[in-house]
């Protein structure tokens, strides 16, 4: 059974992941630029199911495309540095799901915009944090 300290660590990591995803979404929502329209044309794969930490494999597999889309947004008004941000998220995801995981991600048939994608993973973090609180 997980110890209270490991639960606390998991909760903190999930909170960090949640904040990073919220920061990206806030940056995009604040973004007044023709590039935003282009960003919304990129399609992301959504998990068929995302209820456990192992399902973060699906997020990990989409981090490279996410970085590529965020690179489009670089300007003086977009304060997220994609390489640092994605690297940080990647570290958290690996720690949360475990690097030994052999879980194969199953994706939904429908793809999503970056906003829908971020909202899905934000909801995932929030629901798991709620069960740990």
């Amino acid at each position: 059974a997980p110890t209270s300290s490991s639960t606390k660590k998991t909760q903190l990591q999930l909170e960090h992941l949640l904040l990073d995803l919220q920061m990206i979404l806030n940056g995009i929502n604040n973004y007044k630029n023709p590039k935003l329209t282009r960003m919304l044309t990129f399609k992301f794969y959504m998990p068929k199911k995302a209820t456990e930490l192992k399902h973060l494999q699906c997020l990990e597999e989409e981090l490279k495309p996410l970085e590529e889309v965020l690179n489009l947004a670089q300007s003086k008004n977009f304060h997220l540095r994609p390489r640092d941000l994605i690297s940080n998220i990647n570290v958290i995801v690996l720690e949360l799901k475990g690097s030994e995981t052999t879980f194969m991600c199953e994706y939904a048939d429908e793809t999503a915009t970056i906003v829908e994608f971020l909202n899905r993973w934000i909801t995932f973090c929030q629901s798991i944090i709620s069960t740990l609180t």
């Epitope: 904040l19 979404l25 806030n26 929502n29 997220l80 640092d84 941000l85 690297s87 940080n88 929030q126």
Partner: antibody, heavy 113, light 107 residues
Framework: QVQLVQSGAEVKKPGASVKVSCKAS????????MHWVRQAPGQGLEWMGI????????SYALKFQGRVTMTRDTSTSTVYMELSSLRSEDTAVYYC??????WGQGTLVTVSS | DIQMTQSPSSLSASVGDRVTITCRAS??????LAWYQQKPGKAPKLLIY???SLDEGVPSRFSGSGSGTDFTLTISSLQPEDFATYYC?????????FGQGTKVEIK
Amino acid sequence: QVQLVQSGAEVKKPGASVKVSCKASGYTFTRYYMHWVRQAPGQGLEWMGIINPRAGYTSYALKFQGRVTMTRDTSTSTVYMELSSLRSEDTAVYYCTSGWDVWGQGTLVTVSS
Amino acid sequence: DIQMTQSPSSLSASVGDRVTITCRASQSISTWLAWYQQKPGKAPKLLIYAASSLDEGVPSRFSGSGSGTDFTLTISSLQPEDFATYYCQQSYSFPVTFGQGTKVEIK
């Protein structure tokens, strides 16, 4: 103990910039993201933005975008909030808060000609 | 942005009274709600997080309830040190937003 200590009160002229510091102690600096919140005299609380203290990236409220810059110095466990093009409406107490349960004492910034 | 509306904006009560403050979100925020107490010239103090969890060291006379859009902060028996302004806050989505505050005054 865990605490955030902010720099002292500032008086600035309209159009100038102000840089407020917030020094963390008693915990691992990179463990909690830092928010900045301000409160104008007799008014409520207003979120300005957030900084990830480990990687240094930020996200700001739309109202402050283009005027606010949040930075950090991991060697001194300090975060900074700089607000430019000051106007009288920016007169407020500025707070840093780590994880929402630990707050700095606040820094009064007065903008007056 | 999610709007947070508190009511009442002020209230007068006596020591020993039961006090209830409500907060309504403009959209569902699940239980991503916190309550703060602020005294003049001081920083806000976290009382309740996750809608109903009491922060460390906060007296048990404070309690929070609700989920979705409607939330309540209750002080079961008002003490002299409880006269202050109380704020609700959502952290469900950025930008983080606060209610306009409820000032609890001595009757």
